[in-house]
């Protein structure tokens, strides 16, 4: 096991280039952001803790035809240690809370850059 | 259910213009992607490009010149241009839909038959 | 772009035995740990039809008969054991890098 965010995480977390490298791809999208993102696409929001990769990625798939998260999508897959399809939800849900996709990636962006400033990424 | 379905004038003639509808039923486009894909007869198929449920396009680089790729929400339509046909332009054009992540062509229209001749 | 060159070009295939397709990329058509390489089966005047997604995932619906392998730049699709039905030509396509791309295509006779 690994330790991510102070939760036991089971499966690979990313390492630090990874970690950067989606922090960078986050960061890029919000910055680049004209139109609403993915067309203001709603989404679950999710807990930021244990398994974080998977939730976000099981709320993101759900997300077609957004070619802004494409790359996230890929990223968030690769660090994920199972597979996940659209329609798939977990407990790391949170289920009564949806919100935009450009909400979702900002949380999701000042949570990485927490865990990248305290070294959680091994 | 997901429906796709091609129309087109089924005879070109050379150095004009081709423009073929892709009528869509059962989804959103502002949702989804939609591929051009083609089909010379008795030969394989050939990606042309595509429109994002976003609206971005991809193309073909081969034909990225003389393609055009855009659509109407909400009319459900998706429109293809592709200019200067040529002979070898003649084929099968099918538009197709993309799944969910990791966007692989799920669902197909039947396809809409164009010969380009004078 | 992204070459992919699918061989052999053309099969036949005993029923109840097994059917090897390979596609070949010219680069590398992985990604964070995936493979964005698809497998789809067209049968004479009929759309293409997917079979196997990221190089060895079933698509619903689709039978076990029918497995893909391969990463990176080599791949293969398997049909064992082939029955009658599977008479069609297969395509590779990929949509990592670039423009998508389609596999020549690989047809299937049943002896």
């Known amino acids: 096991l690994t330790c991510l965010g102070g939760f036991a995480s089971p499966g690979p977390v990313p390492p630090s280039t990874a970690l950067r490298e989606l922090i960078e791809e986050l960061v890029n999208i919000t910055q680049n952001q004209k139109a609403p993102l993915c067309n203001g696409s709603m989404v679950w929001s999710i807990n930021l803790t244990a398994g974080m990769y998977c939730a976000a990625l099981e709320s993101l798939i759900n997300v077609s035809g957004c070619s802004a998260i494409e790359k996230t999508q890929r990223m968030l897959s690769g660090f994920c240690p199972h597979k996940v399809s659209a329609g798939q939800f977990s407990s790391l849900h949170v289920r009564d809370t949806k919100i935009e996709v450009a909400q979702f990636v900002k949380d999701l962006l000042l949570h990485l850059k927490k865990l990248f400033r305290e070294g959680q990424f091994n | 259910q997901v429906q796709l379905k091609e129309s087109g004038p089924g005879l070109v003639a050379p150095s004009q213009s081709l423009s073929i509808t892709c009528t869509v039923s059962?989804?959103?486009?502002?949702?989804?992607?939609i591929n051009w894909v083609r089909q010379p007869p008795g030969k394989g198929l050939e990606w042309l490009g595509m429109?994002?449920?976003?609206?971005?396009?991809d193309f073909n680089s081969a034909l990225k010149s003389r393609l055009s790729i855009s659509k109407d929400n909400s009319k459900s339509q998706v429109f293809l241009k592709l200019n200067s046909l040529q002979t070898d332009d003649t084929a099968r054009y099918y538009c197709?839909?993309?799944?969910?992540?990791?966007?692989?062509?799920?669902?197909w229209g039947q396809g809409t038959s164009v010969t380009v001749s004078s | 772009h992204i070459v992919l060159t699918q061989s052999p070009a053309s099969l036949a295939v005993s029923l109840g035995q097994r059917a090897t397709i390979s596609c070949r990329a010219s680069?590398?058509?992985?990604?964070?740990?995936?493979?964005?390489l698809h497998w789809y089966q067209q049968k004479p005047g009929q759309p293409p039809k997917l079979l196997i997604y990221?190089?060895?995932k079933l698509e619903s619906g689709v039978p076990a008969r029918f497995s893909g392998s391969g990463s990176r730049t080599d791949f293969t699709l398997t049909i064992d054991p082939v029955e009658a039905d599977d008479a069609a030509t297969y395509y590779c396509?990929?949509?990592?890098?670039?423009?998508?791309?389609f596999g020549g295509g690989s047809k299937l006779e049943i002896k």
């Open positions: 197709a839909r993309d799944g969910y992540y990791p966007y692989a062509i799920k669902f």
């Open positions: 059962g989804f959103s486009l502002t949702g989804h992607n």
């Open positions: 429109i994002w449920g976003d609206g971005n396009t």
């Open positions: 680069e590398t058509v992985d990604s964070y740990g995936s493979s964005f």
């Open positions: 990221l190089a060895s």
């Open positions: 396509q990929q949509n990592n890098e670039g423009p998508r791309t």
